[in-house]
């Protein structure tokens, strides 16, 4: 049974989201469940340090980006949010959180301000930003 | 083929008006900004402001700000600079550029980085 | 301050590499784009952020940061690089975009 859920302030056009846990979750109260990952986005601005904390202490993480498939919900997301891609000066790269490498192809990182941190946008893009300036979040927990 | 086509040169008195047009074609007009940026003779690059399309408000330079308005037609794929009260100082080759990035639905922040422009247009300012 | 500033003027022999710069307080915080003008023709995007080139720019053209500068490098410069060449960024102080001075290089 798909349930609609409108969240026109979170998202560009109206989505529909499955909330069943039979078929998917279970997730935190008040959480998106959509293909077997809890999602919750948080209107208070926070650097890149607290927001990691903040999903930290909901047993969660900042947003990991694996699969245009199985995410696909984020293609339409509004505005910037801090996830968990941070950049590794001494080789260059881009790791998340778990430290598993950003894999190629998955998000447009977009190289305006200068930062270690990035910030999703919609359509899978990553802009990258100052670790320390404050914005609004995504944590993301996996459902087992 | 992805181009912007503005409109034909304009000679205008003190005092006057001009409005210069800037047609896309070959990409998603409504989801790039374009910005407006003028040049006089033998000088250098001036950013006059931008548009986005599917988000209708304009940003303007300080410098500007008062004297120039910027507009977008969606159902053409055209943008437009008006800029009034024009003095000779306004003589310049008015260029449209689009941004290289699309625009973030739901919050706006400038692009610098222009991939495409269009050819000009001189507007002489002359009594 | 909201202003970015380039050498008027620089040269080089052909063939070897020249680097032009550019300064201003946005810089720290801003990656800039370099554009190519040349006499009578629209501006052309030549790098902008971290070293990226637009398709069709030849890898020649090269960009950099550190600290307020930005510098575009052209190494091996080609007689068809003679050009007037623009930085840009971002205003320090709200949503602006600024242009440095333009930096004519004449190639000897």
């Known amino acids: 049974i798909w349930s609609a859920v409108f969240l026109n302030s979170l998202f560009n056009q109206e989505v529909q989201i499955p909330l069943t846990e039979s078929y998917c979750g279970p997730c935190p109260k008040n959480w998106i469940c959509y293909k077997n990952n809890c999602y919750q986005f948080f209107d208070e601005s926070k650097n890149w340090y607290e927001s990691q904390a903040s999903c930290m202490s909901q047993n969660a993480s900042l947003l990991k980006v694996y699969s245009k498939e199985d995410q696909d919900l984020l293609k339409l997301v509004k505005s910037y949010h801090w996830m968990g891609l941070v950049h590794i000066p001494t080789n260059g790269s881009w790791q998340w959180e778990d430290g598993s490498i950003l894999s190629p192809n998955l998000l447009t990182i977009i190289e305006m301000q200068k930062g270690d941190c990035a910030l999703y946008a919609s359509s899978f893009k990553g802009y990258i930003e100052n670790c320390s300036t404050p914005n609004t979040y995504i944590c993301m927990q996996r459902t087992v | 083929q992805v181009q912007l086509v503005q409109s034909g040169a304009e000679v205008k008195k003190p005092g006057a008006s001009v409005k210069v047009s800037c047609k896309a074609s070959g990409y998603t007009f409504t989801s790039y900004g374009i910005s407006w940026v003028r040049q006089a003779p033998g000088q250098g690059l001036e950013w006059m402001g931008g548009?986005?399309?599917?988000?209708?408000?304009?940003n303007y330079a300080q410098k500007f700000q008062g004297r120039v308005t910027i507009t977008a037609d969606e159902s053409t794929s055209t943008a437009y600079m008006e800029l009034s009260s024009l003095r000779s100082e306004d003589t310049a080759v008015y260029y449209c550029?689009?941004?290289?990035?699309?625009?973030?639905?739901?919050?706006?922040?400038?692009?610098?980085?222009?991939?495409?422009w269009g050819r000009g247009t001189l507007v002489t300012v002359s009594s | 301050s909201s202003e970015l500033t380039q050498d008027p003027a620089v040269s080089v022999a052909l063939g070897q590499t020249v680097r032009i710069t550019c300064q201003g307080d946005?810089?720290?915080?801003?990656?800039a784009s370099w554009y190519q003008q040349k006499p009578g023709q629209a501006p052309v995007l030549v790098t902008y952020g971290n070293n990226k080139r637009p398709s069709g720019i030849p890898d020649r053209f090269s960009g950099s940061s550190s600290g307020n500068t930005a510098s575009l490098t052209i190494t091996g410069t080609q007689a068809e690089d003679e050009a007037d060449y623009y930085c840009?960024?971002?205003?320090?102080?709200?949503?602006?975009?600024?242009f440095g001075g333009g930096t004519k290089l004449t190639v000897l």
């Open positions: 550029a689009k941004d290289l990035y699309d625009y973030v639905w739901g919050s706006y922040r400038p692009n610098w980085y222009f991939d495409l």
């Open positions: 946005s810089l720290r915080g801003y990656y």
């Open positions: 840009n960024s971002r205003d320090n102080n709200g949503n602006f975009v600024i």
């Open positions: 548009i986005i399309p599917i988000f209708g408000t304009a």
